[in-house]
C-alpha cells in the first residue's frame, strides 16, 4: 500500500541527519515523502538552504559545482516550504521525472545555513553535518548491498510534484552508492498537511526528456 | 496583526532623491525580510530589493548604485532611498514581506 | 537573471469556468514560484508559494502546480471577484524577478 513517508525537515535540528551519516529512506512505489523548509521561530535564526538532487560522487564529496540541479530554496521565513516527492511507476507526460526501482537517489544542500552561504556550492551542511537524504527506490531495507546499487539520472516532470518511475528510458549512468552509512527514516503513515511542491528542470543535460 | 505601510512624498523633482520608510507591525525585522517591489505602466512590477533579517542587503542590478535600503530594528523601519530620479521611475512603491504587502505610495517624478 | 514569461498577456472567462494561466522560467528554478493576485487599485495578494503550496486564506479554487521551468495557477469555479491581475515571481536567486502579469476578465 501506498503510504506518506514521515515527512523532513530541512533543519540543523532535525535529529534524523546524523554525525557522519546520511538519513535513508526506502520508499516503495506509490509513496510521498515531505521535505520541508521549516518557517522562522522566534529567538532562533532562520537557516537558509538551496537543495539539490545530484549525483552519487556529489554528495560523497559535498559538491554541487557541476551540474547543479535545484529543487528548493528555503529563503522565506515567513512560509514552511513543503516540497513533495511522489515515487510514481510511470509519469503521465512527457516531460515526467523518473527513477529507476532499485536505484538510489541523492539530496543535499552544500548551504552552510547563512544568508551569506545560500549559493555555496562545496560543503555546507553536507559535510558538516550530513545533511543528506538517500533515496533506495523500490529497495529492502533488510537486502541491500552497496556493490549491487547502481544510480541513474532522471527525466523532467511538469507537474507539482517530483514524480519517481521505474522505467526511465532517458536516464543515463550508472554509479555506485556512497559510503553506505545512513539513518534509516521511519516509514509509518503519515498524513503530512498542505500542497505539494516539485523539483527541477535542468537546462544543461543532467536530467534526459523521454 | 502583521501590516506594512509606507510613507514618502508624491512627488519628487528630477535627479533628486526618493525616500520612503517603510514601518512594520505584528512582527519583527530581525525574523522577517522586508522587500521593495515598485509597479510602473510600463514595466509591471520590479523587485528592487531586499533587506535581509540578519541585517543584509541585496539590490536588483538594474537600479545600479542608485539604490540604497536600510533599517531601524528599534523603530521596525526598513527605509528606501534612490537618488538621481528620472520620469521613468515614476511608480507606485510597495514594501513587502512577500505574503503580506504595504498600500504603496504613488510617486511621480516631476520636472 | 531569470526571465519569467507568462501567457497569455489576458484572458476572458465566464463565471463558474475553469482558467489555467502560465508562467515560464527562462532557466529551471525548482519550485522557486510564487503567484500573486492583483485587483484593481490594490497591492498585489499572495495565492500561491513554492509552486503550489496555498498562502493562508486562499480558496481551494486557486492551484499551483509545476517545477522546473514550467509554471500554471488554475482557478476552478471562477468568480466575479477572481477579475484581476495575476503575477508570477521566482524568488530562488537575486534578482527575484516577476512575470509581466496575465490579466483575467469576466465576460
Known amino acids: 500500500l501506498a503510504k506518506n513517508l514521515e515527512p523532513v525537515s530541512w533543519s540543523s535540528l532535525n535529529p534524523k541527519f546524523l554525525s557522519g551519516k546520511g538519513l535513508v529512506i526506502y520508499p516503495k512505489i506509490g509513496d510521498k515523502l515531505d521535505i520541508i523548509c521549516p518557517r522562522a521561530e522566534a529567538g532562533r535564526p532562520y537557516e537558509y538552504y538551496k537543495l539539490y538532487l545530484v549525483r552519487p560522487e556529489q554528495a560523497a564529496a559535498c559538491s554541487t559545482v557541476l551540474d547543479p540541479n535545484v529543487l528548493v530554496t528555503c529563503n522565506r521565513p515567513e512560509q514552511e516550504i513543503r516540497f513533495t516527492i511522489k515515487f510514481q511507476e510511470f509519469s503521465p507526460n512527457y516531460m515526467g521525472l523518473e527513477f529507476k526501482k532499485h536505484h538510489d537517489y541523492y539530496i543535499t544542500s552544500t548551504s552552510n545555513g547563512s544568508l551569506e552561504g545560500l549559493e555555496n556550492r562545496e560543503g555546507g551542511v553536507c559535510r558538516t553535518r550530513t545533511m543528506k537524504i538517500i533515496m533506495k527506490v523500490g529497495q529492502d531495507p533488510n537486502a541491500v548491498t552497496p556493490e549491487q546499487l547502481t544510480t541513474s539520472r532522471p527525466s523532467k516532470e511538469a507537474d507539482n510534484t517530483v514524480k519517481m518511475a521505474t522505467q526511465a528510458p532517458g536516464s543515463r549512468g550508472s554509479l555506485g552508492d556512497s559510503d553506505g552509512k545512513h539513518e534509516t527514516v521511519n516509514q509509518e503513515e503519515k498524513s503530512g498537511p498542505g500542497a505539494s511542491g516539485g523539483s527541477s528542470g535542468d537546462p544543461d543535460g543532467f536530467f534526459n526528456s523521454k | 496583526q502583521i501590516q506594512l505601510k509606507e510613507t514618502g512624498p508624491d512627488l519628487v523633482q528630477l535627479t533628486q532623491t526618493l525616500s520612503i520608510t517603510c514601518t512594520v507591525s505584528?512582527?519583527?525585522?530581525?525574523?522577517?525580510?522586508v522587500h521593495w517591489v515598485r509597479q510602473t505602466p510600463g514595466k509591471g512590477l520590479e523587485w528592487m530589493g531586499a533587506?535581509?533579517?540578519?541585517?543584509?542587503?541585496d539590490y536588483n542590478s538594474a537600479f545600479k548604485s542608485r539604490l540604497s535600503i536600510s533599517r531601524d530594528t528599534s523603530k521596525s523601519q526598513v527605509f528606501l532611498n534612490m537618488n538621481s530620479l528620472q520620469a521613468d521611475d515614476t511608480a507606485k512603491y510597495f514594501c513587502?514581506?512577500?505574503?503580506?504587502w504595504g498600500q504603496g505610495v504613488m510617486v511621480t517624478v516631476a520636472s | 537573471e531569470t526571465v519569467m514569461t507568462q501567457s497569455p498577456t489576458s484572458m476572458s472567462t465566464s463565471i463558474g469556468e475553469r482558467v489555467t494561466l502560465n508562467c515560464k522560467a527562462s532557466?529551471?528554478?525548482?519550485?522557486?514560484v510564487d503567484w500573486y493576485q492583483q485587483t484593481p487599485g490594490q497591492s498585489p495578494k499572495l495565492l500561491i508559494y513554492?509552486?503550489?503550496n496555498r498562502h493562508t486564506g486562499v480558496p481551494d479554487r486557486f492551484t499551483g502546480s509545476g517545477f522546473g521551468r514550467d509554471f500554471t495557477l488554475t482557478i476552478s469555479n471562477v468568480e466575479a471577484e477572481d477579475l484581476a491581475v495575476y503575477y508570477c515571481?521566482?524568488?530562488?536567486?537575486?534578482?527575484?524577478?516577476f512575470g509581466s502579469g496575465t490579466k483575467l476578465e469576466i465576460k
Open positions: 513587502a514581506r512577500l505574503d503580506y
Open positions: 505584528g512582527f519583527s525585522l530581525t525574523t522577517y525580510n
Open positions: 533587506m535581509w533579517n540578519g541585517g543584509r542587503t
Open positions: 532557466q529551471s528554478v525548482g519550485i522557486d
Open positions: 513554492g509552486a503550489s
Open positions: 515571481l521566482h524568488y530562488g536567486s537575486i534578482p527575484f524577478t
